[in-house]
């Protein structure tokens, strides 16, 4: 389906405020340290050129391709070579080189101060003075910040903060009506940062076939009374919808997405019951609510696999007729029957299958050799679910906080290499799990722990790939994307690390420590823990309690003294040298 | 298991069409591959057309662009929409499935079959 003018086409299937808000998306996306007003022009004059083109496809430029105008387009920034550095070097490139380039620059933990939240009366001026550039402004920081946050998502996000101040700059009280809202978005709009880094990440590293096996498995749970030719047909479809946005196609991916919510919802009775009511709404909540529609209920009466995966004839011609059909179809009918399944393990499953026949169809006696193979499943099932069970129980028995830390030591342990910030980081993360995922009933406690897990690792390895300093961190992000937590579940404590010299200075507290919010406390006591771990990494769980609650005992000492700082001044090497004596 | 019963035969003037459909029932046989076969009187069996998992056909030469199979997964059905019908397409047809990617051409390789329907063609 080609088109005169893409610019063109574009525009006029997405409409001028989408077409707008993509474009900022995908510029701040690239140019991450550009100002907020450079970005405004920039977009402005691609919107205005795009109106040429649509008034006259023919026009001057309105045959270049996306990539070619866009990345022109960027290439006009005067401070390229000062801000940037070798990222300008894209610029002496030609199309596809030049936009694999900008994407490969592209900064998962970039040097950016965390955004402040203003007082509401202030936000709520700026809204109401100027909307459009208080929306736009939302959507640079949230895109410049998360490089690979899913675009056409970002605008539903976006279409959510403005009705939150629609309705709330007008309430009695506003800050009680827009605070919760604004800390849901922001929390919300993480995990579907992180959600989406896994899918980009899926892509990127382990290829389409990665991500077409994780989507058949998880459309097939979502969907599980569709055929399975409706399941690869939606997982073609949503695999160029990633593929386009994680390559910074965003006009396509969103026009595409799109296309695929008019699909579903034109094809709902041979798809799922459940997409109804996603249905009626517009398109951005259109597309969010499908995304994350509920799995519709199993059809009764699934017959056992066996019969076609392991007792049938032609369990091995269909395998070498077509290897990955089979495989998927296996997929499919493992995951519509196992909603109660992560979808790593579904993968890991679906891998023994392949493993098992790659060397049986080989073998004398092939039906001899596969007979067994499903139960081969169960140590690769019980693994997960013995793992959610231990890690719940220790999360009820400790609390979000402490579960937290006996993860931040465990981790530290693991990886001691691993960047202080980033361990942190990572383990507060996983120690999240314990609260979003322990609650819930058993058939839905590993899909959602494990799964989770899978999303902040790979945050892990994404940030490690940009500073790489351990070989176990490597091998577990770049050997298996299925495997990653078990790799990661299985490492021990780093014997060949050698513990990092005490430094007085990352134990020395402040009377600011005093002024901190709750969470902002925690991350300093938990900073200081990975240190300890860092410099006594063989200190037992009873020794590192010690400290620690000897930590917080300090901490609100000198937080209720008349002089704090003079408290802390003093105390400090007190609790530093009688925490050295407990680790002696 | 699987067991297939055919419908839709019957007598029919040259030129004229009818309709077979095959009802599957025991497990949804979407995945599977479906066939349909011919015998008349006094010959083998022979291949008509065939029908996977996507919905991708084969035909037989003598009856390509007369005859379409096609399949409905939500009744679990398979058909054989038979147009400009001959004399010599007088024969039972039957019904048959088998759990394969790639569909067969060879009644050997089905694993279940229909009891056949009748069709005559009369000039």
């Known amino acids: 389906d080609t088109h005169k003018s893409e610019v063109a086409h574009r525009f006029k299937d997405l409409g001028e405020e989408h077409f707008k808000g993509l474009v900022l998306v995908a510029f701040s996306q690239y140019l991450q340290q550009c100002p907020f007003e450079e970005h405004v022009k920039l977009v402005n004059e691609v919107t205005e050129f795009a109106k040429t083109c649509v008034a006259d496809e023919s026009a001057e430029n309105c045959d270049k391709s996306l990539h070619t105008l866009f990345g022109d387009k960027l290439c006009t920034v005067a401070t390229l070579r000062e801000t940037y550095g070798e990222m300008a070097d894209c610029c002496a490139k030609q199309e596809p080189e030049r936009n694999e380039c900008f994407l490969q620059h592209k900064d998962d933990n970039p040097n950016l101060p965390p955004l402040v939240r203003p007082e509401v009366d202030v936000m709520c001026t700026a809204f109401h003075d100027n909307e459009a550039t208080f929306l736009k402004k939302y959507l640079y920081e949230v895109a410049r910040r998360h490089p690979y946050f899913y675009a056409p998502e970002l605008l539903f996000f976006a279409a959510r903060y403005k009705a939150a101040f629609a309705e709330c700059c007008q309430a009695a009280d506003k800050a009680a009506c827009l605070l919760p809202k604004l800390d849901e978005l922001r929390d919300e709009g993480k995990a579907s940062s992180a959600k989406q880094r896994l899918k980009c990440a899926s892509l990127q590293k382990f290829g389409d076939r990665a991500f077409k096996a994780w989507a058949v498995a998880r459309l097939s749970q979502k969907f599980p009374k569709a055929e399975f030719a409706e399941v690869s047909k939606l997982v073609t479809d949503l695999t160029k919808v990633h593929t386009e946005c994680c390559h910074g196609d965003l006009l396509e991916c969103a026009d595409d997405r799109a296309d695929l919510a008019k699909y579903m919802c034109e094809n709902q009775d041979s798809i799922s019951s459940k997409l109804k009511e996603c249905c009626d709404k517009p398109l951005l909540e259109k597309s969010h609510c499908l995304a994350e529609v509920e799995n519709d209920e199993m059809p009764a009466d699934l017959p056992s696999l066996a019969a076609d995966y392991v007792e049938s004839k032609d369990v091995c011609k269909n395998y070498a007729e077509a290897k990955d059909v089979f495989l998927g179809m296996f997929l499919y009918e493992y995951a519509r029957r196992h909603p109660d399944y992560s979808v790593m393990l579904l993968l890991r499953l679906a891998k023994a299958y392949e493993a098992t026949l790659e060397k049986c169809c080989a073998a004398a006696d092939p039906h001899e050799c596969y007979a067994k193979v499903f139960d081969e499943f169960q140590p690769l099932v019980e693994e997960p679910q013995n793992l959610v069970k231990q890690n719940c129980e220790l999360f009820e028995q400790l609390g979000e906080y402490k579960f937290q830390n006996a993860l931040l030591v465990r981790y530290t342990k693991k990886v001691p290499q691993v960047s202080t910030p980033t361990l942190v980081e990572v383990s507060r993360n996983l120690g999240k799990v314990g609260a979003k995922c322990c609650k819930l009933p058993e058939a839905k406690r590993m899909p959602c722990a494990e799964d989770y897990l899978s999303v902040v690792l790979n945050r892990l390895c994404v940030l490690h790939e940009k500073t790489p300093v351990s070989e176990k961190v490597t091998k577990c992000c770049t050997e298996s994307l299925v495997n990653r937590r078990p790799c990661f579940s299985a490492l021990e404590l780093d014997e060949a690390y050698v513990p990092k010299a005490f430094n007085a200075e990352t134990f020395t507290f402040h009377a600011d420590m005093c002024t901190l919010s709750e969470k902002e406390k925690q991350v300093k006591k938990q900073t200081a823990l990975v240190e300890l771990v860092k410099h006594k990494p063989k200190a037992t769980k009873e020794q590192l309690k010690g400290v620690m609650d000897n930590f917080a005992a300090f901490v609100e000492k000198c937080c209720k003294a008349d002089d704090k700082e003079a408290c802390f001044a003093e105390e400090g090497p007190k609790f530093v040298a009688a925490s050295q004596a407990a680790l002696a | 298991q699987v067991q297939l019963n055919e419908s839709g035969g019957g007598m029919v003037q040259a030129g004229g069409s009818l309709r077979l459909s095959c009802a599957a029932s025991?497990?949804?046989?979407?995945?599977?591959?479906a066939g349909w076969f011919r015998q008349a009187p006094g010959k083998e069996r022979e291949f008509v057309a065939a029908?996977?998992?996507?919905?991708?056909?084969t035909y037989a030469d003598s009856v390509k662009g007369r005859f379409i199979i096609s399949r409905e997964y939500a009744k679990n059905t398979v058909a054989l929409q038979m147009n400009s019908l001959k004399p010599e397409d007088t024969a039972v047809y039957y019904c048959a499935a088998v759990f394969r990617i790639v569909a067969p051409k060879t009644q050997y390789e089905y694993d279940y079959w229909g009891q056949g329907t009748q069709v005559t063609v009369s000039s």
């Open positions: 025991g497990r949804t046989v979407s995945n599977y591959a």
């Open positions: 029908i996977n998992w996507n919905k991708t056909t």
